[in-house]
């Protein structure tokens, strides 16, 4: 069994290396940016709309194109739930230092958890996406 797990890990590792998860990152960032531009940024000050809506993010087409490409990539992990989770964790890790607020991080995490379902794929049952804002100190 240990041998099988080792092979499974290796197979997952090579799948992750081959996969291009950027479209997923782009899709998710556009999605949460659009939501925030629409509803204002700070849920604690509803009277304040720190960032006004912007036509820049109303494109939609670009985002759906990213989503389609993202789903194609995630499809590769359909038969390996643990590997699907690792792909989601990698997306979280890659974007965590862009998210400098708890709300932004939670929203990104929510969208990320829903991603497999949006793609018509099974979502991993248990998948820990915890990373504090800023991820690891990369600089």
């Amino acid at each position: 069994r240990q041998q099988w797990e080792l092979q499974g890990d290796r197979r997952c590792q090579s799948q992750l290396e081959r996969a291009n998860l950027r479209p997923c990152e782009q899709h998710l960032m556009q999605k949460i940016q659009r939501d925030e531009d629409s509803y204002g940024r700070d849920p604690y000050s509803p009277s304040q709309d720190p960032y006004s809506p912007s036509p820049y993010d109303r494109r939609g087409a670009g985002s759906s194109q990213h989503q389609e490409r993202c789903c194609n990539e995630l499809n590769e992990f359909e038969n390996n739930q643990r590997c699907m989770c690792e792909a989601l964790q990698q997306i979280m890790e890659n974007q965590s230092d862009r998210l400098q607020g708890r709300q932004q991080e939670q929203q990104f995490k929510r969208e990320l958890r829903n991603l497999p379902q949006q793609c018509g794929l099974r979502a991993p049952q248990r998948c820990d996406l915890e990373v504090e804002s800023g991820g690891r100190d990369r600089y």
Partner: antibody, heavy 118, light 111 residues
Framework: EVQLVESGGGLVQPGGSLRLSCAAS????????MHWVRQAPGKGLEWVSA????????YYADSVKGRFTISRDNSKNTLYLQMNSLRAEDTAVYYC???????????WGQGTLVTVSS | EIVLTQSPATLSLSPGERATLSCRSS???????????LDWYQQKPGQAPRLLIY???KRASGVPARFSGSGSGTDFTLTISSLEPEDSALYYC????????FGGGTKLEIK
């Protein structure tokens, strides 16, 4: 309304220490990355340091690394900058700023002046 | 370290004219998520800076429509379509791709 009030500035001799504070109100302080930015008299803006909302991640400009320490007390809604081994070139107005959540400096305090001179 | 170079250092124009401020980065500011991590800030004498534009082209709330940001990669522009007397100020670009760094600033004078 978001308010950021800096304090702790003053005159200090080269080699001395100073601790700046920034009292925050009007938003959920423990939900945002916070920054220190400085501006020497008649000069441009220089980003100094930042700290993530839980305090786990700390970032510093090369010019202050090893001398300055950023910290926060989320129970007191306060941001700090401990400045050691101060030099004449650290003389500046120090601003504290709140991150938008996406790495932009959305709200700023009015600043506190630090003068390093003998 | 990413270095931002702003030009011109000083710009002197009349009310109603169009102002074009430039910011050039020593490396691309496009993140893998597709966004350009470049902001523009305005600072008037004796005041704290104010965010005008974030992520290269998005206008912060309360910022008049005459302010717009454009560019991608290493070359960015802040345009003020029709200058008002109150636009007289210092303008800074700031990158947020790798930690944070400001450009040297452009002083905009209204004749």
């Amino acid at each position: 309304e978001v308010q950021l009030v800096e304090s702790g500035g003053g005159l200090v001799q080269p080699g001395g220490s100073l601790r700046l504070s920034c009292a925050a109100s009007g938003f959920a302080f423990n939900d945002y990355t916070m920054h220190w930015v400085r501006q020497a008299p008649g000069k441009g803006l220089e980003w100094v340091s930042a700290i993530s909302y839980g305090g786990t991640n700390k970032y510093y400009a090369d010019s202050v690394k090893g001398r300055f320490t950023i910290s926060r007390d989320n129970s007191k809604n306060t941001l700090y900058l401990q400045m050691n081994s101060l030099r004449a070139e650290d003389t500046a107005v120090y601003y504290c700023a709140k991150d938008s959540g996406y790495r932009s400096l959305l709200h700023w305090g009015q600043g506190t002046l630090v003068t390093v001179s003998s | 370290e990413i270095v931002l170079t702003q030009s011109p250092a000083t710009l002197s124009l009349s009310p109603g004219e169009r102002a074009t401020l430039s910011c050039r980065s020593s490396q691309s500011l496009v993140h893998r998520n597709g966004y350009n991590y470049l902001d523009w800030y305005q600072q008037k004498p004796g005041q704290a800076p104010r965010l005008l534009i974030y992520m290269a082209s998005k206008r912060a709330s309360g910022v008049p429509a005459r302010f717009s940001g454009s560019g991608s990669g290493t070359d960015f522009t802040l345009t003020i379509s029709s200058l008002e007397p109150e636009d007289s100020a210092l303008y800074y670009c700031m990158q947020a791709l790798q930690t944070w760094t400001f450009g040297g600033g452009t002083k905009l004078e209204i004749k």
